[in-house]
């Protein structure tokens, strides 16, 4: 008999290349691949769960940064007066769910931020548990 | 035939809002389903394997605190002289194993510190390991 | 009808006890029933996908020290004149790639650095994506 | 005082190989990004190469990619430029920049000249 | 990949304003960063992100930057200012210079 094997983890890396001010990040997926989806540059949670999240990135201008999952509720990370970010953390997250980026610049510009090595993963914890697709 | 599903992984959150000086913190798990247990402000470890560990906290006061998982070994984490904390590690575990707080203060009051947004998380690693229930 | 176990999670620690100056560290899986394994003091890769990874020590020394996994690609990790480490991270690593460290010290002796407690945790975050043996 | 010196500048035949080299003291070069830029002789400055504090990234500018490498030493406070495939439009002066913020060219060195002749 | 035009020679009166330009597809989009350089020495930062002035560089360099070009200007120019000017942006983490613009004050 043939070992059951895993069904798919939910997983997603995602890179930004500019952050927009007073608005967010523009993310993309670079795998076709991946068991998440990115709609209107936020990564739908389909799985409820503990998240494994991971953020990297280097800016061109200082700035503050936060990462929200849900209106009214505080963010999963939050950067004040920052030129880079390399902060790893877990979050319970659950179906609804959306994981997007707002930005602050404290420049008088409103062009937009370049960054370089931007990346955002985030690692599904507790497969067996809700998820509607 | 239907694609297998995975058990649930042993995962918890627990809260805390106040620690006792020369003690622990007093642990309180908010959900029904979690897959792993509170006893004596302890969690109770059931599966040997590496666990993911989040530990975030704002004290009301200085104090350092170590998180303990086995008499006579170190310390899963040790902050000295801290008002807060926000730290992940991962750490291998293994049935019998209990996860406690010990608290101090480096004040002469002996009152309880309060603790805001107080939250440890434990996430087991490796499913399909030993487990005694 | 038993319900599906999880098959093993790609997981291993090592430890190490010294490095040598411009060259790597010397490491050791303390235990038999390690999941992944360990060739030419690299850490096989033999899964695709997302890696938990952490690494702790300390050094007699100051030193640089990068963990790599591919050639011609940028570190894991990368520690600049440090006495310590203790960090986390998130990486995607494949089939063929290797784990190993690279050390560098800024003394004139080119004795070896003994480290205290060294350790580095590696736990694949994908189970049931591409493995190969 | 900050110092950036590039070393590592010769003449070479077409078609052949140099590593470049440029020695940061005087500020934490690991916590610095850094680039490589280049100026023909007579001409305006290009771009050539990237590499941010991590050493995560790596960038080259259409003309090298494929030719050239950009590296680093964060232990020995060093950057790296390995030329191969050279040619005769590559003759410029090289000269290493940094920046605390990984746009901006805030220190650069007094450069090294790479002919490429027959 | 993105141009960046300058003109190759600009020159001004002594403590006069000299203007210096850059044109380049949607400039004002980018963030423009200019660099003096003197003969047989290397590049000085002088404005990044538009408009903004590194520490120790003298009030009268200033910088501007809307549609299709980005202006570096020199308000009562000074004999020390005679120099090559060049503008600089990034795209996606690739960077482009301008061809540079010689300034002569007179």
């Known amino acids: 008999q043939v070992p059951p094997q895993y069904p798919p983890i939910q997983s997603i890396r995602v890179q930004f290349t500019r952050c927009e001010n007073e608005k967010g990040c523009i993310i993309t997926s670079p795998s076709k691949d991946e068991t998440m989806k990115v709609q209107d540059n936020s990564i739908i949670i389909n799985c409820d769960g503990f998240y494994l999240i991971s953020l990297k990135g280097y800016f061109s201008e200082e700035l503050s940064l936060s990462l929200y999952y849900r209106k009214g509720r505080g963010p999963l990370f939050s950067l004040s007066k920052v030129t880079s970010v390399d902060s790893i953390g877990v979050a319970y997250l659950a179906f609804k769910d959306k994981v997007y980026f707002n930005v602050t610049t404290h420049s008088t510009s409103y062009k937009d931020i370049q960054v370089n090595g931007g990346e955002l993963i985030l690692i599904h914890q507790n497969p067996g548990g809700f998820c509607a697709y | 035939q239907v694609p297998p599903q995975y058990p649930p992984i042993q995962s918890i959150r627990v809260q805390f809002t106040r620690c006792e000086n020369e003690k622990g913190c007093i642990i309180t798990s908010p959900s029904k389903d979690e897959t792993m247990k509170v006893q004596d402000n302890s969690i109770i470890i059931n599966c040997d394997g590496f666990y993911l560990i989040s530990l975030k906290g704002y004290f009301s006061e200085e104090l350092s605190l170590s998180l303990y998982y086995r008499k006579g070994r170190g310390p899963l984490f040790s902050l000295s002289k801290v008002t807060s904390v926000d730290s992940i590690g991962v750490a291998y575990l293994a049935f019998k194993d209990k996860v406690y707080f010990n608290v101090t203060t480096h004040s002469t009051s002996y009152k309880d510190i309060q603790v805001n947004g107080g939250e440890l998380i434990l996430i087991h690693q490796n499913p399909g390991g030993f487990c005694a229930y | 009808q038993v319900p599906p176990q999880y098959p093993p999670i790609q997981s291993i620690r090592v430890q190490f006890t010294r490095c040598e100056n411009e060259k790597g560290c010397i490491i050791t899986s303390p235990s038999k029933d390690e999941t992944m394994k360990v060739q030419d003091n690299s850490i096989i890769i033999n899964c695709d996908g997302f890696y938990l990874i952490s690494l702790k020590g300390y050094f007699s020394e100051e030193l640089s020290l990068s963990l790599y996994y591919r050639k011609g690609r940028g570190p894991l990790f990368s520690l600049s004149k440090v006495t310590s480490v203790d960090s986390i991270g998130v990486a995607y690593l494949a089939f063929k790639d290797k784990v190993y460290f690279n050390v560098t010290t800024h003394s004139t002796s080119y004795k070896d650095i003994q480290v205290n407690g060294g350790e580095l945790i590696l736990i694949h975050q994908n189970p049931g994506g591409f493995c190969a043996y | 005082e900050v110092q950036l010196v590039e070393s590592g500048g010769d003449l070479v035949k077409p078609g052949g190989s140099l590593r470049l080299s440029c020695v940061a003291s005087?500020?934490?070069?690991?916590?610095?990004?850094m680039s490589w830029v280049r100026q023909a002789p007579g001409k305006g400055l290009q771009w050539v190469a990237f590499?941010?504090?991590?050493?995560?990234?790596?960038t080259y500018a259409d003309a090298v990619k494929g030719r050239f490498t950009i590296s680093r030493d964060n232990a020995k406070n060093t950057l790296y430029l390995q030329m191969n495939s050279l040619r005769a439009e590559d003759t410029a002066v090289y000269y290493c920049?940094?920046?605390?913020?990984?746009?901006?060219?805030?220190?650069w060195g007094q450069g090294t000249l790479v002919t490429v002749s027959s | 990949s993105y141009v960046l035009t300058q003109l190759p020679s600009v020159s001004v009166t002594l403590r006069q304003t000299a203007r210096i330009t850059c044109g380049g597809d949607?400039?004002?989009?980018?963030?423009v960063y200019w660099y003096q350089q003197n003969l047989g020495q290397a590049p000085v930062l002088i404005i990044y992100?538009?408009?903004n002035r590194p520490t120790g560089i003298p009030e009268r360099f200033s910088g501007a930057s809307s549609g299709n070009t980005a202006t570096l200007t020199i308000s009562g120019a000074l004999a020390e200012d005679e120099a090559d000017y060049y503008c600089?942006?990034?795209?996606?983490?690739?960077?482009?210079f301008g061809g540079g613009t010689h300034l002569t004050v007179l």
């Open positions: 590499i941010n504090s991590a050493e995560s990234s790596t």
């Open positions: 949607i400039i004002g989009s980018k963030s």
């Open positions: 992100r538009d408009t």
């Open positions: 920049a940094g920046g605390y913020i990984w746009t901006h060219f805030d220190y």
């Open positions: 600089q942006v990034w795209d996606s983490s690739t960077s482009v």
């Open positions: 005087g500020f934490t070069f690991s916590s610095y990004h």
